[in-house]
Structure formats: C-alpha cells, structure tokens
Amino acid sequence: WGFKDGIFHNSIWLERAAGVYHREARSGKYKLTYAEAKAVCEFEGGHLATYKQLEAARKIGFHVCAAGWMAKGRVGYPIVKPGPNCGFGKTGIIDYGIRLNRSERWDAYCYNPHAKECGGVFTDPKQIFKSPGFPNEYEDNQICYWHIRLKYGQRIHLSFLDFDLEDDPGCLADYVEIYDSYDDVHGFVGRYCGDELPDDIISTGNVMTLKFLSDASVTAGGFQIKYVAMDPVSKSSQGKNTSTTSTGNKNFLAGRFSHL
C-alpha cells in the first residue's frame, strides 16, 4: 500500500482493458515473431494494438510485465506502477521501438474492438458499472474487476439499480463480490447472487473493489451498480460507521461488517 496524489495504490492490475489484452504462445513467453503475433490477434478477431491503444489501456490500469509486439513492428509493455523488477522504475509504455528484425521473438498485444469490456480502475466521483452486454444477458466465463479509487478522505456509496444473477444457495456459480479495499483479498463485505436487490453499501475508506464472476453455464439478466463519492464530514458530525449490509437477502454472504 502507498499514497500518491491522495489516492491509495497497490498492485492489483487489469489483464484486459479498453479492448487491449496480452497474448503469448502456447509454448510460453517470448516465442512469437511479428508475423505470428499478428496472426494470433487476427485469429481471435482482432489485430495488433497500436501504441496509442496500449497507452489508453494502461491509463485505466492495464499493467503487464512482458514485452510484446504492437502494430507496425513496435515492441513494448505497459507499466502502471513502477517496480524493481519491471519497467526500470518508470511508468508508461516501456518502448523498445520499431524492430528492424521482425523475426525477433516477443509476446503480443492485441486489440479487439468487439470484445465485451468489463472492469477497470475508476477515480470519477460517480459511475455506473454494468455487467458485460447489459441489458442483454451476460456471457459465461466472465471475470471482471472494478477498482474504485477516490480522493483520500472520501468514501464510496454503492447502490444496486438492477440485479439478476444465476441463483444458487452458496452463490458459487455466478456472483458479485464487494470488498472494502483496493483488492479482492482484504475487507470482504459480501457475495451476492439471485435477483433480490442488495442494500446500499458505504465504504470505510476511499477505495472499494467489485468482482463479477460467471461460470461455464447458465446466465441471467445481469446488473447495474452505481457508486457516488461521499465527501468527508467534519469530526463533530461523524457518527458510527454507516456501512450497511442486508440481513434479509438470502443471497448475501456476510463479511466482516456488523449488521445495522
């Protein structure tokens, strides 16, 4: 954990953003020539990402520590947060430039304009998250992470506008999980499925994570979840923690929060 610009940071990063994703050969890392990298992307219905597309993805949290081919024979990789083992301590696109030898072997950065996007890093004061394809049914085998990161001192008010996920007793198939932290390890609030609208949730700090997962079968209508930034309140007007959870929702697995 650390502070930068009044915002919490840690090392949870997106594997896909703004239509851009990383691919390597079946046999492992750094095995693709430029022509093969191009073929990999085209077989999946996309093409090699341009430098601009990779940078746009990086800006919303796309971070991969592996050099890959881009359009026009360029090689590089996107770094969101500098680290000792990757990116030479820099952020941005670590750019190896346009390669003269197109037979060099790297990974690939693909761009697929048709991909149903989900997830991202959000710093706006308000936003609505939708399941991929909403209002149409979401697809199988989806994993999406929405990381909310507001100004230090602000809190997050989360409300469920629409909610319809495959229902099962333990929410083991399709579910939304909420975390009162910037990752999906700490601060577990709850896991939700079914079609009952969960109660509003208010964070304890300036960060929150939503995770959506769907399994390999049975889909449903999906969801819309809204958040709004709550500005800090003065100490004199602060009461007890206003974080709420629903005791009435049978499709809710309670986390560490007390029920109010």
Partner: antibody
Framework: QVQLQQSGAELAKPGASVRLSCQAS????????MHWVKQRPRQGLEWIGY????????KCHQKFKDKATLTADKSSNTASMQLSSLTYEDSAVYYC?????????????WGQGTTLTVSS | ENVLTQSPAIMSASPGEKVTMTCSAT?????MHWYQQKSSTSPKLWIY???KLASGVPGRFSGSGSGNSYSLTISSMEAEDVATYYC?????????FGAGTKLELK
C-alpha cells in the same frame, strides 16, 4: 472423458441447406475452439473454419465463406455448421474437431463425422 | 495459403523396416502436427508440436524438423501402422493439411 458427438447422416437435394451439429462433453465448452473439416470420398482433409464459443467469433476459409455458417450454443455445449446452396461437390464427411485456444493451433479431439450426401 | 506437400504419396514397408515420410511447407512454420487416419474412421492426433507424441502413440514414432521441412519417422514398421498420415499447420490462416502419405504393408 472428452467426446464430440456429431449428428447423423444427411441426404439433401441440390440447392437445399443442411445443418450439422456437434455436441461436446467432458470439458468446458467455452475454453476451447471448435473447427470443422471436410473430407470427400477417398480424398484428403480440408479445413473449413472455426468458432470461438466464448465470444461467438467465427472465421471460415475463403473458399467456404459463402457456403458455411458456424454457430455455437453455450447452453447446450453444441457447435453447428449450416451448409447452404448445396451442390454435388458438398457430398463428403464433415468432422468437428476441438483445438486449444493457444497458438499455434492443433486438433486434439475429433467427432466421429457426419456423412452428407447431395443427390437429386 | 501455406501449401503443405507430402512425399511420398504412397509407400509400402515391410515389418521391422524404418519408415520416413516428409512434409514441406511453402511458408515457414514454428511447429508441424501429424494425424493418423485409418479407413472409415476419424483422424487421430498422432504427433503435435513437431516432436511430441500424442497419448497412446507407440514410442517407435518420432517427429522432427523446423522451418519449411518436417518429417515423421517409424523406427520399426508394424502391421498396425498401416494408415494415411497427414501433416497439418496451425500457424497461418487458412489452416492447411498436406495431401497425405498412404502407408501400406509390403
């Protein structure tokens, strides 16, 4: 165990359309790609195209672009191929074959084949 | 289109004999794969990624090659090896098969 069960033999008239199906079992349907391969009597194998069930994206060999339409139904784990405007040259055995999504591709499991006979 | 040329088209071998068939590609590929097909049955994956034997394939089979030239070898021919063998490339669109080498028993 992995199985690809194809629909039964078809007899169709020239100009008609036919839909062949391939039901997958024993693995997660959406994590692999499904390809279709044609084999005319006493001849070699010819790749038709593939579908990525997770996204629905499909692509056919240019030669089959106006002939074959590939679809996948995730709820029934079934891939299908519709062949249109049938001619005698479409008489063949058609196989579905699974490939990994990892490049470069190869087919690790095949269906038993569907025999299509086009005859007036 | 990456055309795969297999040779010979037909060959016969006596039991115990060493057998080699080749596959040449018009464009370089990183791996070649091989399928075995016996009459009236579906093809079976036989060798993948140039030299890896598929599950259940006897150890007398081997594959080698790189770039544009690949081969399948049987160290000691057996009666059950009678079949047609197809090479296949999955690197370039469109995916392509060779025309096959038919292996018979002498």
């Amino acid at each position: 165990q992995v199985q690809l069960q194809q629909s039964g033999a078809e007899l169709a008239k020239p100009g008609a359309s036919v839909r062949l199906s391939c039901q997958a079992s024993g693995y997660t349907f959406t994590t692999y790609w499904m390809h279709w391969v044609k084999q005319r009597p006493r001849q070699g194998l010819e790749w038709i195209g593939y579908i990525i069930p997770s996204s629905g994206y499909s692509k056919c060999h240019q030669k089959f672009k106006d002939k074959a339409t590939l679809t996948a139904d995730k709820s029934s784990n079934t891939a299908s191929m519709q062949l249109s405007s049938l001619t005698y040259e479409d008489s063949a055995v058609y196989y579905c074959a699974r490939s990994t999504s990892g490049y470069p591709y190869y087919f690790d499991y095949w269906g038993q084949g569907t025999t299509l006979t086009v005859s007036s | 289109e990456n055309v795969l040329t297999q040779s010979p088209a037909i060959m016969s071998a006596s039991p115990g004999e060493k057998v080699t068939m080749t596959c040449s590609a018009t464009s370089s590929v990183s791996y070649m794969h091989w399928y075995q097909q016996k009459s009236s049955t579906s093809p079976k994956l036989w060798i993948y990624d140039t030299s890896k034997l598929a599950s259940g394939v006897p150890g007398r089979f081997s594959g080698s090659g790189s770039g544009n030239s690949y081969s399948l070898t049987i160290s000691s021919m057996e009666a059950e090896d009678v079949a047609t063998y197809y090479c296949f490339q999955g690197s370039w669109y469109p995916l392509t098969f060779g025309a096959g080498t038919k292996l018979e028993l002498k």
